[in-house]
């Protein structure tokens, strides 16, 4: 008799990443009988929610339901109906909501409450919405990339199934850049983690990991730009800010009230004699770099060594995966290739920033002007953060791998978050089964 395929025995999970600038929904899938195997969970869908991050809905919470509808309906379509009720849904909010909570716990709670009520209306197993800590964001990003790279597997492969495979079990460090915060997470080499807040201990698949992590709130690319503008407008003589981080010929009016809306600019807040100012781009990488460096306080360090702002950072060790905005920005600038040296990246940034705005708009006609205008700043910021902030050098630059996806799954904290909450990363190495489960009879 002919073998007949059984219904696919799979499970699904949904994680919403409620970031500072936008929300993305990820759908994950894995074989039900291989839950404890490493590397079996993969992403089947990403849906980017149209609109800003959830923290921007503070004055219009009634619109949150509509905002989430399209992507939640997409999840309904992708996941078989029979699986809906057992598919967990998690929403994790990151630095945008951390900042809102700093301003008002009540407002942050109100937003999360409406989000929870909206998500509860769907036929899935809603597991809650919460603001994750910066430490969690760093840790789950580290778990995600190492899980996808097969670093937790004890089986050494003679063939490479993933890019960046170094054919050893040394874990990759994780560099995550968002709109409002940035995280650095890695296993230091035989180094005491001098600051307890930055130390994490994991036992995964029978192996112990002592992990360093830190999340720099206000140092995501969007908040770093607000900080820089707030700092620089204090040195401007008038309502014209000649800004080296924007292309020559670029002009944009900024409301002072918007500038001081975020807690990230509080340290620079002063009474200005105007309500608005105009950014006028002058497109000079070197001056932009210098201005950015002023956001990093490197004059104070209570430890053997620091990143900036007095935060402990052990010596860098091994390879690093740089993802989220690190990847998106460098991908746009065509600088993600392993062959591009740090000197070459700097050279390319100098040329890019110096290009006139009119020329840039013509060259990238399909890109939204708001995003297009900020790539000079963002690229320069990434270089400044990695080189002066985290102390990468021209030599260690080659250990940074700009990663968008690994094996079809986005690099980011969401997969690690779900793996943890669904208990799919065992502390001990699972016993290997002599026979694999057949899906045919």
């Amino acid at each position: 008799t002919q073998n007949k395929a059984l219904p696919e025995n799979v499970k699904y999970g949904i994680v919403l990443d409620a970031g500072s600038s936008h929300t993305s929904l990820y759908i994950y899938k894995w074989p039900a009988e291989k839950e404890n195997d490493t590397g079996v969970v993969h992403q089947v869908e990403e849906c980017r929610v149209k609109g800003p991050g959830i923290s921007k809905f503070v004055q219009k919470v009634n619109e949150i339901g509509i905002y989430l509808t399209d992507c939640m309906e997409r999840a309904r379509e992708v996941i078989p109906r029979s699986q809906h009720q057992e598919t967990p849904v998690y929403l994790g909010a990151t630095a945008g909501m951390r900042l809102l909570r700093m301003e008002s716990e009540e407002l942050a709670d109100r937003v999360l409450d409406v989000v929870e009520r909206s998500l509860s209306n769907y036929p899935f197993d809603f597991q809650g919405a919460r603001i994750i800590t910066g430490q969690e964001e760093g840790a789950y990003g580290w778990i995600t990339i190492n899980y996808l790279l097969g670093k937790f597997s004890q089986k050494t492969r003679w063939f490479s199934i993933v890019p960046y495979e170094t054919n050893n079990q040394e874990t990759f460090g994780a560099l995550d850049l968002g709109g409002a915060s940035t995280q650095v997470t890695f296993v230091p080499q035989n180094q005491t983690i001098e600051s307890p807040d930055n130390a994490l201990q994991f036992r995964l698949y029978g192996k112990d990991y002592n992990v360093y992590t830190h999340s720099f709130l206000c140092y995501g690319k969007d908040q770093a730009l607000w900080q820089k503008l707030a700092k620089d407008i204090q040195v401007a003589s008038n309502e014209i800010l000649r800004d080296p981080c924007f292309h020559p010929g670029y002009k944009k009016v900024v409301n002072v009230s918007d500038l001081y809306k975020t807690p990230c600019t509080k340290r620079f807040e002063m009474t200005l004699p105007f309500q608005q100012f105009e950014i006028q781009g002058i497109g000079n990488y070197q001056q932009c770099h210098q201005s950015i460096l002023e956001l990093f306080n490197t004059s104070y360090c209570p430890y053997s060594q620091c990143a900036f702002n007095g935060i402990f950072l052990p010596p860098l060790q091994g390879d690093f995966g740089a993802f989220s905005a690190f990847y998106f920005v460098m991908k746009f600038l065509n600088l993600t290739s392993e062959k591009v040296s740090q000197e070459k990246v700097t050279e390319m940034m100098k040329k890019f920033c110096a290009q006139p705005w009119e020329e840039i708009k013509t060259s990238y006609a399909g890109v939204k002007e708001k995003y297009l205008s900020e790539y000079c700043f963002s690229g320069t910021y990434i270089l400044s953060l990695l080189l002066q902030g985290y102390h990468f050098t021209a030599d260690s630059w080659e250990h940074i791998h700009f990663i968008g996806k690994i094996q079809g799954s986005d690099a980011g904290w969401t997969l690690g978050y779900m793996l943890n909450l669904t208990n799919m990363i065992p502390a001990e190495q699972p016993l290997s089964t002599p026979l694999s489960h057949s899906t045919y009879v």
Epitope: Q234, S237, N238, T271, P273, Q290
Partner: antibody, heavy 118, light 110 residues
Framework: QEQLEESGGGLVQPEGSLTLTCKAS?????????MCWVRQAPGKGLEWIGC???????TYYASWAKGRFTISKTSSTAVTLQMTGLTAADTATYFC???????????WGPGTLVTVSS | DIVMTQTPASVSEPVGGTVTIKCQAS??????LAWYQQKPGQPPKLLIY???NLASGVSSRFKGSRSGTEYTLTISDLECADAATYYC????????????FGGGTEVVVK
């Protein structure tokens, strides 16, 4: 040619008042300028008194100058510095300056001497 | 108000020598610093703005730099015409810090 010129200096009695005028020529006092006053006692260093932001009329003063010194814009080409309760310590050359923080906007007048003496 | 501490008060160097003047700000002023040159009977002349930018028409022998809250003016290849008093001025955050000057440094060229 852009120029600033101070006037109104001279001898004044202790506890007396005086108003100095700063006249701009070759340019108008447009909204994008800070117009400032700085003084220098004989043989001493420069001392910032205050500024007016032309665009909004907002004034800023050194903490020691608040109350006794008032900066105003009186026309499209002039700003004034009103001084009250003058003492011998206020004897100085008073400079008017256009403070635009780059290489093109910074402009100073030659100064006017104020002597407070009985 | 912010306090700008300028050192030394006076310095004497021969023609062709180098002079270094330092200015310490009591608060972080984020490169918001200007350097002026003043000769007797004249108003100050802007040399450097935003800590390290050379004003137009100023000789490249004048160099401004910054390290944290300490700012430095270096004059190299001294000429007789460089004999003057030099002042630093805060240019950051007028509403909070004002526009304080340093005490001045008299440069004598031998």
């Amino acid at each position: 040619q852009e120029q600033l010129e101070e006037s109104g200096g001279g001898l004044v009695q202790p506890e007396g008042s005086l108003t100095l005028t700063c006249k701009a020529s070759g340019f108008a006092l447009s909204s994008s300028y800070y117009m400032c006053w700085v003084r220098q006692a004989p043989g001493k260093g420069l001392e910032w008194i205050g500024c007016i932001y032309i665009g909004s009329g907002t004034t800023y003063y050194a903490s020691w100058a608040k109350g006794r010194f008032t900066i105003s814009k009186t026309s499209s080409t002039a700003v004034t510095l009103q001084m009250t309760g003058l003492t011998a310590a206020d004897t100085a050359t008073y400079f008017c300056a256009r403070d635009q923080y780059d290489d093109s906007g910074n402009l100073w007048g030659p100064g006017t001497l104020v002597t407070v003496s009985s | 108000d912010i306090v700008m501490t300028q050192t030394p008060a006076s310095v004497s160097e021969p023609v062709g020598g180098t002079v270094t003047i330092k200015c310490q700000a009591s608060q972080n002023i984020y490169s918001g610093l200007a350097w002026y040159q003043q000769k007797p009977g004249q108003p100050p002349k802007l040399l450097i703005y935003k800590a390290s930018n050379l004003a137009s028409g100023v000789s490249s022998r004048f160099k401004g730099s910054r390290s944290g809250t300490e700012y430095t003016l270096t004059i190299s290849d001294l000429e007789c015409a460089d004999a003057a008093t030099y002042y630093c001025q805060n240019w950051y955050g007028i509403s909070t810090y004002g526009r304080a000057f340093g005490g001045g440094t008299e440069v004598v060229v031998k």
